[in-house]
């Protein structure tokens, strides 16, 4: 196999740029989703975000996040999600397990799912960027 050592493929400046891009795109998605009035956040959905037992950026649950965003893309045609997925794929290993999402069937519940996950994704990218930058600071001290 030609698969190369991971260290060749993860300059920290690239990872930070990817997460910064994801953070910016998550804000765009949330702004778009929030334009739908009368929809409330639900306690029934939780987006996996950071894993406590891994180092940044491997601590980001990128495959699960991708699956949730792919579900939103199928429920509501948000083109920004295409770009989000392309950037998440930069953090996902080819052999990462698939995540199955149970999709709400009720129209209003679908809207609540989209808003809730979009909000959690935005918060998650803020946390991911913080964990990256604090990790980088620790590495230099």
């Amino acid at each position: 196999s030609h698969t190369l050592p991971v260290r060749l493929l993860r300059p920290s400046d690239d990872v930070q740029k990817i997460v910064e891009e994801l953070q910016s795109l998550s804000k765009m998605l949330l702004k778009d989703v929030e334009e739908e009035k009368g929809v409330l956040v639900s306690q029934n959905y939780t987006l996996p975000c950071l894993s406590p037992d891994a180092q940044p950026p491997n601590n980001i649950h990128s495959p699960a996040i991708r699956a949730y965003l792919k579900t939103i893309r199928q429920l509501d045609n948000k083109s920004v999600i295409d770009e989000i997925i392309e950037h998440l794929d930069k953090l996902i290993f080819q052999d990462a397990p698939e995540t199955n999402i149970s999709v709400p069937t009720d129209t209003h519940e679908c809207k609540r799912f989209i808003l809730t996950i979009s909000q959690q994704f935005s918060e998650c990218m803020d946390l991911a960027l913080k964990s990256l930058t604090s990790g980088a600071q620790q590495a230099t001290t």
Partner: antibody, heavy 122, light 107 residues
Framework: QVQLVQSGAEVKKPGSSVKVSCKAS????????MQWVRQAPGQGLEWMGA????????RYSQKFKGRVTITADKSTSTAYMELSSLRSEDTAVYYC???????????????WGQGTTVTVSS | AIQMTQSPSSLSASVGDRVTITCRAS??????LAWYQQKPGKVPKLLIY???TSASGVPSRFSGSRSGTDYTLTISSLQPEDVATYYC?????????FGGGTKVEIK
């Protein structure tokens, strides 16, 4: 050994469609993007679109949107590129290509099909 | 869409010369850039990926480097078998556009 084998040369009339296939062997992973590229005689490489075969997720160049459809059949490890409303300027060699791991996103296309010559002529 | 501006479009150099080809991205694409070599009538071949990593089996005279949004392919000592057209391609976000190509000839 990873191999990409494309379908044979085609001669088509203007206004018709062509469907080129690309069969992958020796590759077991599902999280990757495969791309389609074309090259007109004496011209450079032109990106047409890509597919994530595991999900059938596609991306297209704005230039070909509405005329190109990329699909994949997971059961046979085959990708397809269909181009409709053909015109003489679509005469080109069409290539499929895909990357080596370890990430789902590409950073270079390691494997290329042998190319399929499509000639559009009345 | 991200534009890739490749220069020069063609060059002629002597065997043993150092040759440099440049691609400039219209925005920051990190290290998500590849270089290909295409000989006349042949399939493109990956030379460099991730801006500076050599693909398997590529001679050591080929190297890639990056400075900001400028990417350089260097052939340290041009050989007759290096006569080809060279292309860059970015992979930051779709469309994954190519540079216009650089045709390399021997003087």
């Amino acid at each position: 050994q990873v191999q990409l084998v494309q379908s044979g040369a085609e001669v088509k009339k203007p206004g018709s469609s062509v469907k080129v296939s690309c069969k992958a062997s020796g590759y077991t992973r599902t999280r990757y993007w495969m791309q389609w590229v074309r090259q007109a005689p004496g011209q450079g490489l032109e990106w047409m679109g890509a597919i994530y075969p595991g999900e059938g997720d596609t991306r297209y160049s704005q230039k070909f949107k509405g005329r190109v459809t990329i699909t994949a059949d997971k059961s046979t490890s085959t990708a397809y590129m269909e181009l409709s409303s053909l015109r003489s300027e679509d005469t080109a060699v069409y290539y499929c290509a895909f990357p080596e791991g370890p990430y789902a996103a590409p950073y270079g296309m390691h494997y290329w099909g042998q190319g399929t010559t499509v000639t559009v002529s009345s | 869409a991200i534009q890739m501006t490749q220069s020069p479009s063609s060059l002629s150099a002597s065997v043993g010369d150092r040759v440099t080809i440049t691609c400039r991205a219209s925005r920051n694409i990190g290290n998500y850039l590849a270089w290909y070599q295409q000989k006349p009538g042949k399939v493109p071949k990956l030379l460099i990926y991730y801006a500076k990593t050599s693909a398997s089996g590529v001679p050591s005279r080929f190297s890639g480097s990056r400075s900001g949004t400028d990417y350089t392919l260097t052939i340290s000592s041009l050989q007759p078998e290096d006569v080809a057209t060279y292309y860059c391609q970015h992979f930051w976000s779709t469309p994954w556009t190519f540079g216009g190509g650089t045709k390399v000839e021997i003087k």
